[in-house]
């Protein structure tokens, strides 16, 4: 809860002008939902639905709220202390190695494989070999059985804030 974000924690493009060194870890910091004024004297509220800050900080600006892409649904809106939480629409998923877009889930498993996991907002359907029980690589098969996946279950967000 008492974590803090300072200018140095931000990516270069998010950093504001350098600030004087603080004499203690929490001196001159503003609460979540706020940023510090340029003279370092006041705390200014983030704008509801526009920007946010999640920790005690000495940021000169709040962080801009994420906008959900088309193909995503908004699970929870941006508040002054929490970024928007977006999730892939039903029938699509986001992989860890390609987080920039939602991909369509496969409609079924290749011949000789059975479905053991449904399409969820964060994973494709899961297929295993009937005999060996080993998982399929996840490539879209050339030939598909008529095993279809059930709708994705509501679940964890794909875009979480700290």
């Amino acid at each position: 809860e008492s974590a803090l974000i300072t200018q140095q924690d931000l990516a270069p493009q998010q950093r504001a002008a350098p600030q004087q060194k603080r004499s203690s870890p929490s001196e001159g910091l503003c609460p979540p939902g706020h940023h510090i004024s340029e003279d370092g004297r006041d705390c200014i509220s983030c704008k509801y639905g526009q920007d946010y800050s999640t920790h005690w900080n000495d940021l000169l600006f709040c962080l801009r709220c994420t906008r959900c892409d088309s193909g995503e649904v908004e699970l929870s809106p941006c508040t002054t202390t929490r970024n928007t939480v977006c999730q892939c629409e039903e029938g699509t998923f986001r992989e860890e190695d390609s987080p920039e877009m939602c991909r369509k889930c496969r409609t079924g498993c290749p011949r000789g494989m059975v479905k053991v996991g449904d399409c969820t907002p964060w994973s494709d359907i899961e297929c295993v070999h009937k005999e060996s029980g080993t998982k399929h690589s996840g490539e879209v098969p050339a030939v598909e059985e008529t095993v279809t996946s059930s709708p994705g279950t509501p679940a964890s967000p794909c875009s979480l804030s700290g």
Epitope: S26, P31, P32, D42, C43, S45, W56, T80, T81
Partner: antibody
Framework: QVQLVQSGAEVKKPGASVKVSCKAS????????LHWVRQAPGQGLEWMGW????????KYNEKFKDRVTITADKSTSTVYMELSSLRSEDTAVYYC????????????WGQGTLVTVSS | DIQMTQSPSFLSASVGDRVTITCRAS??????VAWYQQKPGKAPKLLIY???TRHTGVPDRFSGSGSGTDFTLTISSLQPEDIATYYC?????????FGGGTKLEIK
């Protein structure tokens, strides 16, 4: 349930100091910011400053900065406000109030402590 | 510091009346305004925050609106228990400041 229980009324002479306490219960002490707000008789409300037990952050209203000291005892979940060099215009009801670590509005208030400054 | 100017400072109305209290900020405060109700000898109680969000347990006859510099608290149908003094507060920039109050009485 959330409770902020303040110390009793005080009568002080001009130039003296007063220390008012506010004991918090019914919630996690380190998750909320505690504030002091005062109200002179028949007057409006005036924010004096805050203390955040989670990181010991303190912020004062510049108007009171030279005379007010806010401290806390985490072992008893109590916050203190000491006001020095008292003058007659400091006669007021002093409230502690809390707010979540977010927008600066106050969702729970103590019952208030009347401080009278009179020679 | 931001000045919050409330009007009227005194208001007399009948039970069932629609009552409107206004608050003007000396500079843009976005929607960072809260409203409180205070009864004699008691601490203030939070009614509205973010200009229009009702606090938990507040009757829906209380509503708030506004953004920028002009804000309104409305009681759609005044009840005897609503007799109190009402304060606006800006929570946009420290020092957080309050309006001078509007004392509401029953005609």
């Amino acid at each position: 349930q959330v409770q902020l229980v303040q110390s009793g009324a005080e009568v002080k002479k001009p130039g003296a100091s007063v220390k008012v306490s506010c004991k918090a219960s019914g919630y996690t002490f380190t998750e909320y910011i505690l504030h002091w707000v005062r109200q002179a008789p028949g007057q409006g409300l005036e924010w004096m400053g805050w203390f955040y037990p989670g990181n010991n952050n303190i912020k004062y209203n510049e108007k009171f900065k030279d005379r007010v000291t806010i401290t806390a005892d985490k072992s008893t979940s109590t916050v203190y406000m000491e006001l020095s060099s008292l003058r007659s215009e400091d006669t007021a009801v002093y409230y502690c109030a809390r707010h979540e670590q977010g927008p600066g509005y106050f969702d729970y208030w103590g019952q208030g402590t009347l401080v009278t400054v009179s020679s | 510091d931001i000045q919050m100017t409330q009007s009227p400072s005194f208001l007399s109305a009948s039970v069932g009346d629609r009552v409107t209290i206004t608050c003007r900020a000396s500079q843009d405060v976005n929607t960072a305004v809260a409203w409180y109700q205070q009864k004699p000898g008691k601490a203030p109680k939070l009614l509205i925050y973010w200009a229009s969000t009702r606090h938990t347990g507040v009757p829906d006859r209380f509503s708030g609106s506004g953004s920028g510099t002009d804000f309104t608290l409305t009681i759609s149908s005044l009840q005897p228990e609503d007799i109190a003094t009402y304060y606006c507060q800006q929570h946009y920039i420290t020092p957080w400041t309050f309006g001078g109050g509007t004392k509401l009485e029953i005609k």
